[in-house]
């Protein structure tokens, strides 16, 4: 059902927005411990004027690699809704063009047996910091599309 703009962004507000907000709400505590360093993904992929669809397409693809990371069923369900819902709605709005096949997400460093607990914890925190930022950017980008603002 391609009812994203026709009825005040109904599909977005009733499905995507709810899931994004649920996810962000569950990640409220994350942020203060996040490193200041910019993630490569956000250096390269920007929700810029005329490139919103391109950004959201890649962001949705990136989200998929976080499935099963958090272990709670609700969390995964909301992630799936945001990822698949974004892809579906992009097709509805004609904002995304076909791309060559791509691997899911950036290559992760291989874990050695000696990797200690604190490094694993730091990596998980880093992943969650990234995921929170990704969800915030997806939300902002969808809002930009729905408001029709074409700010350069």
């Amino acid at each position: 059902d391609c009812d994203i703009e026709g009825k005040d962004g109904k599909q977005y507000e009733s499905v995507l927005m709810v899931s994004i907000d649920q996810l962000l709400d569950s990640m409220k505590e994350i942020g203060s411990n996040c490193l200041n360093n910019e993630f490569n993904f956000f250096k390269r992929h920007i929700c810029d004027a005329n490139k919103e669809g391109m950004f959201l397409f890649r962001a949705a693809r990136k989200l998929r690699q976080f499935l099963k990371m958090n272990s709670t069923g609700d969390f995964d369900l909301h992630l799936l809704k945001v990822s698949e819902g974004t892809t579906i709605l992009l097709n509805c709005t004609g904002q995304v063009k076909g791309r060559k096949p791509a691997a899911l997400g950036e290559a992760q460093p291989t874990k050695s047996l000696e990797e200690n607990k604190s490094l694993k914890e730091q990596k998980k925190l880093n992943d969650l910091c990234f995921l929170k930022r990704l969800l915030q950017e997806i939300k902002t980008c969808w809002n930009k599309i729905l408001m029709g603002t074409k700010e350069h």
Partner: antibody, heavy 117, light 111 residues
Framework: QVQLVESGGGVVQPGRSLRLSCAAS????????VHWVRQAPGKGLEWLAA???????DYNSAFSSRFTISRDNSKNTLYLQMNSLRAEDTAVYYC???????????WGQGTLVTVSS | DIQMTQSPSSLSASVGDRVTITCKAS??????????INWYQQKPGKAPKLLIY???NVEFGVPARFSGSGSGTDFTLTISSLQPEDFATYYC?????????FGGGTKVEIK
Amino acid sequence: QVQLVESGGGVVQPGRSLRLSCAASGFTFSSYGVHWVRQAPGKGLEWLAAIWTGGSTDYNSAFSSRFTISRDNSKNTLYLQMNSLRAEDTAVYYCARNGYGESFAYWGQGTLVTVSS
Amino acid sequence: DIQMTQSPSSLSASVGDRVTITCKASESLDHDGDSYINWYQQKPGKAPKLLIYMGSNVEFGVPARFSGSGSGTDFTLTISSLQPEDFATYYCQQSNVDPLTFGGGTKVEIK
């Protein structure tokens, strides 16, 4: 429309310092990474540094000991502090807004820095 | 650092000609299904202008006669039918690995 205007260039003696500014308008400055790129007379382009939305920085290691990039989001301004200047730093210095694929989507007109005794 | 070797360094062409500029990287610019190479046009006394980003995406407002292709280490900028305003210097730039680096430029002159 997006506008970037560099200032602060001029003639400076070797060994001295200079601070370049880049005033941004026409977009939400705090939401974008910004870069400094330079071009020596008659030569190619050379990336110097970038500063991201959260304030983290990336440098070309060839310049990281002498050049410092910073930003003031409240003034919509980007800076490049250049120390221990050399004759080979003579160039037009451009600021550029980060674009998709970490390209340089928008450029200022450039400011000329001449290092000469 | 990744070296970007552009060729030719200069070329002479006529209006209407198909022009091809190549850029060879010292290591692959591919990541996650995309090629991190961008192309710029620069006219004397002016700042560069972005033409193509991420290998093959034409920047908004750039004429369709400009196109980018390639993957891995070998990339091409093509101008399908050269126009009078296209006489300029063209640069490739990689953004796969810091430091970001440019090719040496290709000057397109009138024959």
